[in-house]
Interface confidence: low
């Protein structure tokens, strides 16, 4: 079954451009750097249109084919497995002329006991094995390699690595009598990595290992693993950073407790100790240390495991996230939410900004959303006037010197954008929501009104009225 | 094979109770999530009740709540409901179901048996 | 509660034609991309029997005459070419939260 969005670009789109890689000279590949919009963002649809000309004026130098698609190699190694004993593998899209490696860890959730995970393989079969998987995938957003989609790195080589293990990147164990299935998530990685080095990320300068969902948490518990195994490779000059979205969650206390019945609804906390005896999960040395013998699951959580990595990462992640409420068990049913849940939900905005207060590099718009970096439409949501993309670009400038994101942020490029104000949509930007019924788009004040926030109770805590609040916000400030 | 069947329904008169139950064969009983669902007559079909595989967890539809009580014996692969002061109502076919994993659908019906409820 | 809303309430459509069966939820029934939607057939005296679970997926044994799209809150279950075995009332049921919910029904005629 196709269980995950792919976010496909429609039909009518016009084609990509094409490239606008040199030759590099001899054997010697010639980095290209991430374009500066500094100059330019008054006048981003003009300065894309000159891109974009200039990109297929080159394009009769190139020799790459003007191709979209990621296509797909089954790991050579064929005892790196999905859940089902079927190889592992990845989406490759190589881009000769650029030395920045983009990897992207697919999210979906998990399984836990053999229970669920026997459920998952009959529903959702293509996240637990390779056999149904297509020749080719498109990239989106992040994965793009059109620059009017992906203006941070278009120009990268992209892979996507299908998430096939169901152990949040974790897993450590492979299919035997004993077992039904294997959980092999962190050594798909590793499995990766080292095939991709005699594909040319040998000669790479940035690996940039991403992830969305699951795959964001898999980029946390993944990272310094990554760094580590291709130092020990003898590649030390890679620099390994990680971008983990929509991953970055909180052991919070549930809304509403429930037992732990089924994926969806089992506390987080008790599903990853759960699933962590399972699937012999393995966490970053530095963060295990930090717990005792059985308290790893700890670091399957951003602010616990952050502190103790040595590799950059930044972090993004929707304020209000719908799979943080969902396990929270939190459902918004469009009916008017009781006091009870709008403080909870709020608090629930003010916990997660609380855990990034020291994550220099971070991107969190006050949205309920779930998911960004490949979605086509991931350049969209700005924070404080600043889009994710340019936000990526602003943190790699900012490691040309430090390993570590610097606290002192390039002037007129800031790297940590985390939205203040206290509701859902309250940023103007944020991701569309229609109403269901009629299909019509609804703006912020009319979402809120949607959700049975009551205006005047809004209001109050920001000491405005509430017609001036909704001025305010039909405004976009 | 997998098989559901529901017995214990009958002429009840309004305020009354009846208890139904569903034994279920042909499958590792304790495993499931199991439901109770119910169809008016000439109606649509209407969820009612739902056990985790444990019987830890139960919810009810806001239209039973306080008067049905659904339970579940793994022993003796089971499941029961429990239906105290009837209404008009109330009147349906009743069905259990087994719910899958995850997906929470009803990939198993039982035939059901009817509950009349009438003075 | 989420409530599901079918259209038409009923539909009569010739033998071999194409029928197509709506169902709008509430609220999204679909998270981290799985679409927690469900279609059911139920033939007079007879329980309910599951067509398509996952918004998409089609059960064993089903033939694959019937389909499922949709994600969201609009899905529609598609007879590709109508038999008179077909005949029956649908139901498309949601599983996303408790309380489960179904539509109202569409009765499929000849």
């Known amino acids: 079954s196709e269980g995950r969005k792919t976010w496909r670009r429609r039909g009518q789109q016009p084609p990509p451009p094409p490239r606008t890689e040199a030759a590099p000279a001899a054997g010697q590949p010639v980095e290209s750097f991430p374009l500066d919009f500094t100059a330019v963002e008054g006048n981003m649809d003009s300065f894309m249109a000159q891109v974009k000309s200039l990109a297929q004026s080159l394009y009769p130098c190139s020799a790459q084919q003007l191709n979209e698609d990621l296509r797909l190699h089954l790991l050579l190694n064929t005892s790196v497995t999905c859940n089902d004993g079927s190889p592992a593998g990845y989406y490759l899209k190589e881009s000769r002329g650029s030395r920045r490696w983009l990897l992207f860890l697919e999210g979906g959730w998990y399984c836990f006991n053999r229970e669920n995970c026997d459920s998952r393989y009959d529903t959702m079969r293509r996240l637990m094995s390779s056999r149904d998987w297509p020749r080719t995938r498109t990239g989106t957003g992040i994965l793009s390699s059109q620059p009017e989609e992906n203006p941070y790195w278009w120009n990268a080589n992209m892979v996507f690595i299908p998430y096939c293990s169901s152990d949040v990147w974790s897993g450590a164990s492979s299919k035997s009598e004993k077992n039904e299935y294997a959980f092999m998530g962190a050594l798909i990685i590793q499995e990766v990595v080292r095939e991709l080095l005699g594909r040319g990320l040998s000669g790479a300068k940035v690996l940039l290992l991403a992830g969305s969902s699951a795959g964001g948490t898999g980029v946390l518990l993944n990272v310094d693993r990554v760094a580590e195994q291709l130092e020990k490779l003898g590649y030390p000059a890679i620099q390994v950073r990680g971008l983990a979205d929509s991953g970055w969650f909180l052991d919070n206390k549930q809304y509403r407790h429930t037992d732990c019945v089924d994926t969806i609804t089992c506390a987080p906390t008790e599903a990853i100790r759960r699933g962590i005896r399972y699937w012999n999960g393995v966490v970053p040395e530095r963060c295990r240390r930090q717990f005792q013998e059985g308290e790893e699951w700890n670091c399957f959580f951003g602010y616990k495991v952050y502190p103790t990595l040595r590799c950059p990462v930044f972090v993004v992640q929707w304020l209000f996230d719908e799979a943080q409420l969902t396990v929270d068990n939190v459902h918004l049913t469009g009916q008017p939410v009781q006091e009870g849940l709008r403080l909870y939900i709020q608090n629930l905005g003010r916990e997660l900004r609380h855990t990034l207060k020291d994550v220099p590099a971070s991107f969190a718009p006050a949205c309920l959303s779930h998911e960004i970096i490949i979605r086509s439409h991931w350049t969209d949501v700005q924070v404080k006037g600043t889009s994710l993309p340019r936000a990526l670009h602003c943190w790699d400038r900012s490691l040309h010197d430090s390993h570590k994101a610097s606290k002192t942020p390039l002037k007129g490029c800031p790297v940590h954008l985390v939205d203040s104000c206290p509701w859902p949509h309250c940023n103007p930007s944020c991701p569309t929501v229609r109403d269901q019924f009629t299909g019509q788009e609804m703006n912020v004040a009319q979402f809120l009104m949607h959700m049975g926030f009551d205006m005047q109770t809004v209001a109050q805590p920001q000491g405005l009225e509430p017609s001036e609040l909704l001025g305010m916000l039909s405004n976009g400030s | 094979q997998v098989q559901l069947v529901e017995s214990g329904g009958g002429l009840v008169k309004p305020g009354g109770s009846l208890r139904l139950s569903c034994a279920a064969s042909?499958?590792?009983?304790?495993?499931?999530?199991m439901h109770w669902i119910r169809q008016a007559p000439g109606k649509g079909l209407e969820w009612v009740s739902y056990?985790?595989?444990?019987?830890?967890?139960?919810y009810y539809a806001d239209s039973v709540k306080g008067r049905f009580t659904i339970s579940r014996d793994n022993a003796k692969n089971s499941l029961y409901l429990q239906m105290n002061s009837l209404r008009a109502e109330d009147t349906a076919v009743y069905y259990c179901?087994?719910?899958?994993?995850?997906?929470?659908?009803?990939?198993?019906w039982g035939q059901g048996t009817t509950v009349t409820v009438s003075s | 509660d989420i409530v599901m809303t079918q259209s038409p309430d009923s539909l009569a459509v010739s033998l071999g034609e194409r029928a197509t069966i709506n169902c709008r939820a509430s609220?999204?029934?679909?998270?981290?991309?799985?679409?927690?939607i469900h279609w059911y057939q139920q033939k007079p005296g007879q329980p309910p029997k599951l067509l398509i679970y996952?918004?998409?997926d089609l059960e064993s044994g089903v033939p694959d005459r019937f389909s499922g799209s949709g994600s969201g809150t609009d899905f529609t279950l598609t007879i590709s070419s109508l038999q008179a075995e077909d005949v029956a009332v649908y139901y498309c049921?949601?599983?996303?939260?408790?309380?489960?919910?179904f539509g109202q029904g569409t009765k499929l005629e000849i």
């Open positions: 179901a087994r719910a899958s994993y995850d997906g929470g659908y009803f990939d198993c």
């Open positions: 042909g499958f590792t009983f304790s495993d499931f999530g």
């Open positions: 056990s985790s595989s444990g019987g830890t967890t139960v």
């Open positions: 609220k999204s029934v679909s998270t981290s991309g799985y679409s927690y």
């Open positions: 996952l918004a998409s």
């Open positions: 049921h949601h599983s996303r939260e408790l309380p489960f919910t």
